[in-house]
């Protein structure tokens, strides 16, 4: 891909003197890795993001870039440093031959190198030419707070900021980083160039068809007139936002990324850094009718990833494709025939569809929530978005069978009141990636930094698994699931909750020798049981053991198969109380569920007994689901009896704090 000026004249031939005294060897014992987009047509060979190790200073980045140029020049290669990153990720963007990758990977401070790739606007059609006025009465929707304390950054195409729907609401920054349009005869028509961004700005904050009518926006141009951008341009845009935030700290920031490209380690890393700096990022899941985890920034765990549904709450079909799905999607939102500002004229409206429109809805809702409660953290905001969503309204048959259990059945909704949800104990379910089928394969599910892991479960479609356990990793608990010999792989399922001032620990009992089964309880004063896990080393837990029933009056105890080690998650937090709720079915059943009552939140979900015909247990909203192998293969013996065990908690402390505020 050529420079904007169309040639390589400006490429630097670095001077030999530049490399005097510089060793070529990388830092001892580290190997930098090379990454590129899995989707070949989206690759942009010749431009590379060189990511340096976390603590690298700007001066070191510049020195490393100069060293690369010098060493390349010595080999007769031209290179051009296009940008030096700092503030978000240390590193630099370089235009060079792929022949130099081996050399670049050996440079000191280099963590990894990623080939640049394309990202795309996620709306279809680009412009329908269908101009329509807003189709509802304006007074039907008058939100209590229009998001006036929040700034929403939009990384998109250029926009028509003086459109009647958004005039005065959008500040067009001077940031622009876009690739040349494809095709020699491409005609830049202003209204087409502005189409995508103008529509989304209208969906977020438009006067008449916007979600957060009071939100102010800032736009950065990272997509060209064809709706195409680059990972590197998006990275530089995110860095621009971070620098703006440092120079002039304002109130809460929401960043809307209505674009998608192939999986990108560096784009995900940049999103993580920005999120950890207190910025809320919302992105489109993608319009590829595919697993969102294969795309970026949709696959970044710190980003709120939004799929698209229609007016009937069904997943949106877009031509032969449609909304993405899977465990990387946080929730869905309206994304079909969404009316918003059209750049065709200053008073025009147009209908567009896609996960971009869905993400814009959620960005608007987020702006309103943050305006009402500016101190909300990203974790708190995400939990609230999930909590207030419409549950179980999407027809899951649209999704591929193996993705149904992983895809959240949630459609974003505005909270009935933007205040007063503080007393709730919020929890969400986080699925790991699939472990893969090897005998010792494991899968790990993690909670966000300010969430507590309150329980851990596992699931395998083949039923061949060796359970799960909670373990410490980098000072935080994670949920690890274990595959078994002959298994097709497992998922780990973490129950991640907001529990301020919590002190949680895991108590483990090794496999019992006696036939009564293994049991473990929370013995520390003031600690309550929030979840039970079991893990076993044997390939197949005995299926003919009688099911173990919990002795009455033992609410703080986990019980399990005598050949399994049992893990109890025990937590102490102000006012936290929990209870165990069980639902057992004597006859074999493919699915057994138990739900927590109103006012209580599901923190733990497990199955009794943990025998091999149980595929696993997982939480769906406030319901514990235990899945077993097909009844026809199990027969109706006693081994088919399964009990779903839910642990339901609430926090009296949060309730009291909320009442004091009101």
């Amino acid at each position: 891909q050529e420079d904007e000026d169309g040639d390589y004249e400006e490429l630097v031939l670095a001077l030999r003197s530049e490399e005097d005294g510089l060793a070529e060897a990388p830092e001892h014992g580290t190997t930098a890795t090379f990454h590129r987009c899995a989707k070949d047509p989206w690759r942009l060979p010749g431009t590379y993001v060189v990511v340096l190790k976390e603590e690298t200073h700007l001066s070191q980045s510049e020195r490393t870039a100069r060293r690369l140029q010098a060493q390349a020049a010595r080999r007769g290669y031209l290179t051009k440093i296009l940008h030096v990153f700092h503030g978000l990720l240390p590193g630099f963007l370089v235009k060079m031959s792929g022949d130099l990758l081996e050399l670049a990977l050996k440079l000191p401070h280099v963590d990894y190198i990623e080939e640049d790739s394309s990202v795309f606007a996620q709306s279809i059609p680009w412009n329908l030419e269908r101009i329509t006025p807003p189709r509802y009465r304006a007074d039907e929707y008058q939100p209590p707070d229009g998001g006036s304390l929040v700034e929403v950054y939009l990384l998109d195409t250029s926009i028509q900021s003086d459109h009647r729907e958004i005039e005065g609401r959008v500040m067009v920054t001077d940031f622009e980083n876009v690739p040349e349009e494809d095709g020699t005869r491409f005609h830049r028509q202003a209204s087409k160039c502005d189409s995508h961004g103008t529509h989304l700005a209208g969906v977020v904050s438009g006067r008449d068809a916007g979600v957060a009518k009071g939100a102010s926006m800032r736009s950065l141009r990272v997509l060209n007139c064809q709706g195409k951008g680059t990972v590197s341009g998006t990275l530089i845009g995110l860095e621009f936002i971070r620098k703006s935030q440092l120079v002039q700290p304002v109130g809460p920031l929401v960043v809307l990324l209505p674009l998608a490209g192939g999986y990108s380690r560096v784009l995900n890393a940049a999103c993580q850094r920005l999120a950890r700096a207190g910025v809320v990022l919302v992105t489109a899941a993608g319009n590829f009718r595919d697993d969102a985890c294969l795309y970026s920034p949709a696959s970044a765990p710190e980003v709120i990833t939004v799929g698209a549904t229609n007016a009937q709450d069904q997943p949106v079909t877009l031509g032969t494709l449609g909304t993405n799905f899977g465990r990387c999607v946080d929730l869905f939102a309206p994304g079909e025939d969404i009316i918003g500002a059209s750049s065709d004229c200053s008073t025009c409206f147009v209908s567009q569809s896609g996960t971009s429109q869905a993400a814009a809805h959620v960005a608007g809702i987020a702006a309103m929530m943050l305006s009402a409660e500016p101190e909300l953290t990203l974790a708190e905001l995400r939990q609230r978005l999930i909590h207030f969503s419409a549950k179980d309204v999407i027809n899951e048959a649209w999704f591929p069978e193996d993705q149904r259990v992983l895809t959240p059945n949630l459609v974003a909704a505005l909270p009935p009141s933007t205040h007063g949800a503080g007393w709730q104990l919020f929890c969400r379910t986080v699925w790991s990636a699939h472990s893969g089928p090897t005998r010792m394969a494991t899968a790990v599910a993690r909670c966000a930094p300010d969430e507590e892991l309150l329980s851990c479960s596992s699931f395998s479609r083949s039923g061949k698994r060796r359970g799960e356990r909670m373990e410490a990793q980098g000072g935080k608990l994670v949920c690890r699931a274990h595959n078994a010999f002959g298994g097709e792989g497992v998922y780990a399922i973490a129950r991640c909750c907001l529990l301020p001032q919590a002190n949680c620990s895991v108590h483990t009992a090794p496999p019992a020798e006696a036939s009564m089964g293994t049991r473990v309880h929370c013995h520390q004063q003031g600690h309550v049981l929030t979840g039970c896990s079991s893990h076993w080393e044997v390939e197949d837990l005995g299926t003919h053991k009688p099911p173990v029933l919990r002795p009455r009056g033992q609410p703080n105890q986990c019980v399990g198969h005598r050949e399994a080690s049992i893990h109890a998650s025990c937590c102490h937090a102000p006012g936290l109380e929990c209870k165990v709720k069980e639902h057992g079915i004597p006859a074999p059943q493919e699915q057994v569920t138990v739900a927590c009552e109103e006012g209580w939140t599901l923190t733990g979900c497990s199955a009794l007994p943990g025998t091999s015909h149980v595929l696993g247990a997982y939480a769906v909203d406030n319901t514990c689901v235990v899945r077993s192998r097909d009844v026809s293969t199990t027969g109706s013996t006693s081994e088919g009896a399964v009990t779903a065990v839910a642990i339901c908690c609430r926090s009296r402390h949060l309730a009291q704090a909320s009442q004091e505020l009101q």
């Epitope: 304006a138 028509q160 003086d162 005039e167 005065g168 500040m171 067009v172 006067r207 008449d208 200053s346």
Partner: antibody, heavy 115, light 109 residues
Framework: QVQLVQSGAEVKRPGASVKVSCKAS????????ISWVRQAPGQGLEWMGW????????NYAQKVQGRVTMTTDTSTSTVYMELRSLSSDDTAVYYC????????WGQGTTVTVSS | QSALTQPASVSGSPGQSITISCTGT?????????VSWYQQHPGKPPKLMIY???NRPSGVSIRFSGSKSGNTASLTISGLQAEDEADYFC?????????FGGGTKLTVL
């Protein structure tokens, strides 16, 4: 501060044309268009149209369509409104205002059409 | 003939509250959130007092408030003061343009 400064009063003969200017300052010009509104003596306000400073697009009121032309000169941050084929009915104070929201107004330009 | 209908005049004594109505149709006032109110003193340009139905620009007294029900918008001025005596105009978006009311002369007795 945000300001719109208009050109001075004009006296025109019927059938002639008038061109009124409006110089904007104190804000990001491309974030707002400019509306033109007129007020005949002792009468109410009448919206004449709007022009985009961003791309020059216009939106004219039906009543004056064909007789009015709005233009911009971004180098001087000035917007112009030209009205042709003047008649005594066009005698009015002509205002420019910021955007469709019309939150800031020029001081007004009196145009008198008299034979 | 103005598209939006306002009473020609209203009056009130200092300290009282008055309300000026602005009636349109579902194609203007009823269909959009963008109803504005302007105050105009003789020989001066109009001044924006309320925008988007009920929002007050900075610098405008809290005595001025706006509301809307169906196709009718209202401007209420509480604690009437002598300097409030002026002409008041409402405006609204239509699908492609803007319309004003005929104006209401407020007299402070």
């Amino acid at each position: 501060q945000v300001q719109l400064v208009q050109s001075g009063a004009e006296v025109k003969r019927p059938g002639a044309s008038v061109k009124v200017s409006c110089k904007a300052s104190g804000y990001t010009l491309t974030s707002y268009g400019i509306s033109w509104v007129r007020q005949a003596p002792g009468q109410g306000l009448e919206w004449m149209g709007w022009i985009s400073v961003y791309n020059g697009n216009t939106n004219y009121a039906q009543k004056v369509q064909g007789r009015v032309t709005m233009t911009t000169d971004t180098s001087t941050s000035t917007v112009y409104m030209e009205l042709r084929s003047l008649s005594s009915d066009d005698t009015a104070v002509y205002y420019c205002a910021r955007g469709y929201g019309m939150d800031v107004w020029g001081q007004g330009t009196t145009v008198t059409v008299s034979s | 003939q103005s598209a939006l209908t306002q009473p020609a005049s209203v009056s009130g004594s200092p300290g009282q509250s008055i309300t000026i109505s602005c009636t349109g149709t579902s194609s203007d006032v009823g269909g959009y959130n963008s109803v504005s109110w302007y105050q105009q003193h003789p020989g001066k340009p109009p001044k924006l007092m309320i925008y988007e139905v009920s929002n007050r620009p900075s610098g405008v007294s809290i005595r001025f408030s706006g509301s809307k029900s169906g196709n009718t918008a209202s401007l209420t001025i509480s604690g009437l003061q002598a300097e409030d005596e002026a002409d008041y105009f409402c405006s609204s978006y239509t699908s492609t343009s803007m319309v004003f009311g005929g104006g209401t002369k407020l007299t402070v007795l």
